[in-house]
Interface confidence: medium
């Protein structure tokens, strides 16, 4: 039961990291109160959102002014990768802590008080007590 929910949590974390990477690769849209989606910009002349990709062919279209450049790749990927790695480390830490705690709690029922202070690979019990 617990293992299943942890697996689900890990899957969500990986998915979140992947989405963060995708968003950062897509580049940054110029700020403003625009109703336009990422990679498009408002055309005052045409009164609608236009795809920024068309600015390569027609760079002097009015809406091209609102098309932002994507930041340089190393900086763009640094934070999602770092954040994902830290999150993964945190979840793995929680997972291993939980497994040790479960194992020690099970052993607690069957061991003598002398063994509780000293070992069998369960320092957590001694620390708690």
């Amino acid at each position: 039961m617990a293992r299943g929910s942890l697996r689900r949590l890990l899957r969500l974390l990986v998915l979140g990291l992947w989405l963060a990477l995708l968003r950062s690769v897509a580049g940054e849209q110029a700020p403003g109160t625009a109703p336009c989606s990422r990679g498009s910009s408002w055309s005052a002349d045409l009164d609608k959102c236009m795809d920024c990709a068309s600015c390569r062919a027609r760079p002097h279209s009015d809406f091209c002014l609102g098309c932002a450049a994507a930041p340089p790749a190393p900086f763009r990927l640094l934070w999602p990768i770092l954040g994902g790695a830290l999150s993964l480390t945190f979840v793995l830490g929680l997972l291993s802590g939980f497994l040790v705690w479960r194992r020690c709690r099970r052993r607690e029922k069957f061991t003598t008080p002398i063994e509780e202070t000293g070992g069998e690979g369960c320092p957590a019990v001694a620390l708690i007590q």
């Epitope: 940054e28 005052a44 009164d47 009015d62 002014l65 098309c67 932002a68 450049a69």
Partner: antibody, heavy 120, light 108 residues
């Protein structure tokens, strides 16, 4: 904090050239279009030129077209205005400004201004 | 974009500065208003017709009137520090960014 610091103004003879610089800090430079606006002594504001965040799209007022070139160095967070074939009527305080260009074309951050005097 | 050359009013009173668009509808593109004190760079007091940047007092307000095809900047409770030049600005097809001629506000 968000800041635009200008440099490069001065006295130049008619027909001469000058390059203005505008160093940006405190914001993601590549995400914003940038613009140059000038103000002749005792006159109003006049838009001169604008450039998209990528630098791929440039725009000019008719009065400077073919003489002025706007550019940007995104890794250096710097905006430039190369002014050639300068005339007496180009004498003005030149301001660089950050443009909120997606959905409305307004300037929300301005440089301190730099005086360009064209005189023989 | 046409603005009155100058306006004047006493402290504590309300003043309205107009900005009339000669071609095209005033409502088709957003209007911004800038304040410029002598010897200083302009600062935004109104953007997107009616929006006020943080730090700008609520004595400043912007509006659009389609019947007169003009935008207006209203300053209530006038203070001596409001004395400055005010410029409206909008988008214009072809010239991209266009400014009004400016209005000198004198607080008597």
């Amino acid at each position: 904090q968000v800041q635009l610091v200008q440099s490069g103004g001065g006295l130049v003879k008619p027909g001469g050239s000058l390059r203005l610089s505008c160093a940006a800090s405190g914001f993601t430079f590549t995400s914003y279009a940038m613009s140059w606006v000038r103000q002749a002594p005792g006159k109003g504001l006049e838009w001169v030129s604008a450039i998209s965040g990528s630098g791929g799209s440039t725009y000019y007022a008719d009065s400077v077209k073919g003489r002025f070139t706007i550019s940007r160095d995104n890794p250096k967070n710097t905006l430039y205005l190369q002014m050639n074939s300068l005339r007496a009527e180009d004498t003005a305080v030149y301001y660089c400004a950050r443009v909120r260009a997606n959905y409305y074309y307004g300037m929300d951050v301005w440089g301190q201004g730099t005086l360009v005097t064209v005189s023989s | 974009l046409t603005q009155p050359h100058s306006v004047s009013e006493s402290p504590g009173k309300t003043v309205t500065i107009s900005c009339t668009r000669s071609s095209g509808s005033i409502a088709s593109n957003y209007v911004q208003w800038y304040q410029q004190r002598p010897g200083s760079a302009p600062t935004t007091v109104i953007y997107e017709d009616t929006q006020r940047p943080s730090g700008v007092p609520d004595r400043f307000s912007g509006s659009i009137d389609t019947s007169s095809n003009s935008a207006s900047l209203r300053i209530s409770g006038l203070k001596p520090e409001d004395e400055a030049d005010y410029y409206c600005q909008s988008y214009a097809s072809g010239s991209l960014i266009v400014f009004g001629g400016g209005t000198k506000l004198t607080v008597l």
